[in-house]
């Protein structure tokens, strides 16, 4: 169940977000989330994950990019980018994904 909290060993992560008590936190994994709200600059938040590990597998979009890692302070120097908005091409692309 992805909503259940992880009870494994905890890792120390860099914490830089409006939800941090201090500069580090302890969690099941470390996170970096880059979010762009409509009409605003993107904001990058670092912290700890304990629930919803499925978010780590999400693909980047033009609005959010979610990164997870599992080692000590592994989220400290990670920088994310958002998926660029692609204008519709005039002809179908031929390169497979």
């Amino acid at each position: 169940d992805p909503v259940k909290p992880s009870r494994g060993p905890l890792v120390t992560c860099t914490c830089e977000s409006p939800h941090c008590k201090g500069p580090t936190c302890r969690g099941a994994w470390c996170t970096v989330v880059l979010v762009r709200e409509e009409g605003r600059h993107p904001q990058e938040h670092r912290g700890c994950g304990n629930l919803h590990r499925e978010l780590c597998r999400g693909r980047p979009t033009e609005f959010v990019n979610h990164y997870c890692c599992d080692s000590h302070l592994c989220n400290h120097n990670v920088s994310l980018v958002l998926e660029a908005t692609q204008p519709p091409s005039e002809q179908p692309g031929t390169d497979g994904q």
């Epitope: 909503v3 977000s17 409006p18 939800h19 941090c20 008590k21 201090g22 304990n50 629930l51 919803h52």
Partner: antibody, heavy 113, light 110 residues
Framework: EVQLLESGGGLVQPGGSLRLSCAAS????????MSWVRQAPGKGLEWVAN????????NYVDSMRGRFTISRDNSKNTLYLQMNSLRAEDTAVYYC??????WGQGTLVTVTS | QSVLAQPPSASGTPGQRVTISCSGS????????VYWYQQLPGTAPKLLIY???KRPSGVPDRFSGSKSGTSASLAISGLRSEDEADYYC???????????FGGGTKLTVL
């Protein structure tokens, strides 16, 4: 859009009880720690209690520990504060807050005989 | 008496820069992040600064925060009449295992 809507406030006699609720919407409620903060009329902000994402960890200000109980129901996206043995000095606006950014508009609790 | 100490009042004229101080101890400001909230009359507090000096999306860059040791400050430049409000600092306190607030500073724009 993040929204927090408190309810359950009102007039209560000293020694009485109230249960406050905070309905959350616009975000994944189960991913965030939550708090209750209160503000007596004309006074400053006072932290009451907080609860972690799954409800397994709770912290209280000393003066309210034992009388107040914080809880949450993630399936209903709702935060609660059970307040017992209320005193006149508990009269305040009680705010529900997502730690540590968004706040609701508050619900007024008045304790008087 | 609040755990974090703030001046009860501050004032300035439009366009001026004003600074509000917040003093704590090693168990709160000294080891944890400082937050600043603005409370306009009759409304709920709004987050202005988190993580000592970071602004949430939508907060004007006229507002800035800083921290040194066990003290912090909020600076407001280019003061406007709509900045008239109560301002609160806050931090987590490791000794109390809870959130602590300053007593609030009432800012008047003259």
């Amino acid at each position: 859009e993040v929204q927090l809507l408190e309810s359950g406030g009102g007039l209560v006699q000293p020694g009485g009880s109230l249960r406050l609720s905070c309905a959350a919407s616009g975000f994944t409620f189960s991913s965030y720690a939550m708090s209750w903060v209160r503000q007596a009329p004309g006074k400053g902000l006072e932290w009451v209690a907080n609860i972690n994402q799954d409800g397994s960890e709770k912290n209280y200000v000393d003066s309210m520990r034992g009388r107040f109980t914080i809880s949450r129901d993630n399936s209903k996206n709702t935060l609660y504060l059970q307040m017992n043995s209320l005193r006149a000095e508990d009269t305040a606006v009680y705010y529900c807050a997502r730690e540590f950014d968004y706040w609701g508009q508050g619900t007024l609790v008045t304790v008087t005989s | 008496q609040s755990v974090l100490a703030q001046p009860p009042s501050a004032s300035g004229t439009p366009g001026q820069r004003v600074t509000i101080s917040c003093s704590g101890s090693s168990s709160n400001i000294g080891s944890n992040y400082v937050y600043w909230y603005q409370q306009l009359p009759g409304t709920a507090p709004k987050l202005l600064i988190y993580g000592n000096n970071k602004r949430p999306s939508g907060v004007p860059d006229r507002f800035s925060g800083s921290k040194s040791g066990t003290s912090a400050s909020l600076a407001i430049s280019g003061l406007r009449s709509e900045d008239e409000a109560d301002y609160y600092c806050a931090a987590w306190d490791d000794s109390l295992n809870g959130r602590v607030f300053g007593g609030g500073t009432k800012l008047t724009v003259l």
